[in-house]
Structure formats: C-alpha cells, structure tokens
C-alpha cells in the first residue's frame, strides 16, 4: 500500500511570494496514482484544491482562479508538489496531500 509523507512541518513565506509544498509517495509508483491536495483553514471544513492523475491530468477546485495553485509530480523523486503563487493571508492553512491508488 502507498504511504505519504509531507517532510515540511511548516512553511513561512513573505506576502506575495511563492510557497512550494512537497508530498513524498512511497510503497507505490507515483505514476500509477492520483495525488490530491486539500487545505484546512482554521475553523473551516477541509477543502479540495487540486489533483494530478496517473495520466497527468490536472483538476482544480472550480471556485479558485487558474494560476493560484499549481500541482506537479516528479517521478524521479516520487514527489508531488503544490505551488502556491502570490501568497496571501487567506492562504494560511494546513495543507494535506492524499493518494488514490489506481
């Protein structure tokens, strides 16, 4: 079974900069999975942000503008990354990755 690790416990960024979060997949080939990213803001329910499927198809939360969150995967390091562009106060949250084994 697949296992996920998010090596960064926390990330502190200056406003308007870019934050890059990592999710390391083990126990399964990342190219045979879909990786989903969610966020949980303080006092709010968890929210789907973006996913990248086994075939590279990206799906995003319809309410968030294109260009805000960018998901990628690097098979060589078995890592999925979530890039948050133009960091703002409303991006303060806990971010989770999740795995769907195809």
């Amino acid at each position: 079974a697949g296992h996920l690790e998010q090596p960064q416990i926390s990330s502190t960024k200056t406003l308007s900069k870019t934050a890059r979060l990592e999710c390391v997949v083990s126990g399964i080939t990342i190219s045979a999975t879909s990786v989903y990213w969610y966020r949980e803001r303080p006092g709010e329910v968890i929210q789907f942000l973006v996913s990248i499927s086994y075939d590279g198809t990206v799906r995003k939360e319809s309410g968030i503008p294109s260009g805000k969150f960018e998901v990628d995967r690097i098979p060589e390091t078995s890592t999925s990354t979530l890039t948050i562009h133009n960091v703002e106060k409303q991006d303060i949250a806990t971010y989770y990755c999740a795995l769907w084994e195809v």
């Epitope: 990206v58 799906r59 309410g63 260009g67 960018e70 562009h85 409303q90």
Partner: antibody, heavy 121, light 108 residues
Amino acid sequence: EVQLVESGGGLVKPGGSLRLSCVASGFTFSDYAMDWVRQAPGKGLDWISSISSTSNYIFYADSVKGRFTISRDNAKNSLYLQMNSLRVEDSAVYYCANSYNWNYGGAFDIWGQGTMVTVSS
Amino acid sequence: DIQMTQSPGTLSSSPGERATLSCRASQSVSSSYFAWYQQKPGRAPRLLIYGASSRATGIPDRFSGSGSGTDFTLTISRLEPEDFAVYFCQQYGRSPLTFGGGTKVEIK
C-alpha cells in the same frame, strides 16, 4: 446551455470610466472563478483579471492594477469590470471567460461573445 | 511573468497539407498547464488543446499537441477549410496567465 454574455462597452474619452458586465447562465455561477481577457484590434489575447467564486482571491495584470476593479454578484449571476482612468491602449474587445470543465485544469473553455471598448478623444 | 512566443507569425498552407505551429515559453511551464486556442474573425477563442496534448470535447483528432518544458507544438495533420484561423498558446499554471502573440494560418 452554458453561456456568458458581456455588455457595457462603448466609446469613452481618455481618463474616463466604463463598467462592463457579464451575465452567466446554464451553470451554477457561484461555484466558479471568473476571468476577464481582452484583445486589442488585430492583436493577441491579454488576460487582465481573475476573481474567485467567493471574491476572496482577486488578481490583476500589472497593466490595469490600480485602475480596474473586478467584482461579482452571485445572486445576479453577474461578473463586473469597473474601468477607471482609461487609456487609448485599453481599447479592445473584452471577453469574460470561465474554466467550466474541471478536467481541463483551468484552461478557458467558455467565452462570452465580447464587448468592444474604444478609448479615443 | 512568463512570456510566450509563437512562430511563425503567419503560415501559408493549402487544404490537405500538414501544419506545424510552435510556441516557446521564456521559462519552463508544466505541460499540465498549457493550452492551444483557435480564433476566427469576429469570434471568441475556442479551446482546442489543454494539458499540452489533450483535445477538448468536440475537437477533431487532426489536431494534436505535444511538448514540454519551454517548447510546445500544435500539429494539424490535414488542413480543412475551416481550420484557417489564428491560433494562440497559453500557460495557465501561474498568475499572470499569459498568451502567445498568435499564428495566423492562411490559405496559400
């Protein structure tokens, strides 16, 4: 049918103001981020602004920052672009656009017909 | 900002011929966030390709996209009369979203 219809374009003098509207139908407008893209006559496409479904994320191109304001009224299924301090170089067809199919990852698959803005003295 | 440069500016071809359009990004772009659009005079753009190589719904299979990093290609295997139009590339992975200047495919 999923549809976007823009209005509000016209002729305005440099330094003037104009408010564009885009009315959406055929989908749950309040669930979707929306964008404005413009095209000067005979030129390419220029993205100018985005707004999230709840208006908490708003982005602008540098060329319009401080002059244009994007907003929306989900109760009226409407998107707006308030354009102030207009310049001759703002003359263009203005389109509202939307990434409707979630499989497309954010590419714009729904476009309005456009509304023409001409800035001239 | 990521600049997108398309070439050639104009491509003169005949129906039935193969057309190859190029788009180069000023910095690496994830192929998952790369699109091609077609625009005819007086009309809004129409999405052809998303994710660099996936055809949007209803797009004929004579249109294909490829590429990664900074270099992307749109190929029209056999030009039909309705394919003569202007084509734009776009990156939509990071704001500001940016488009190429366009390639006009005209009848020779």
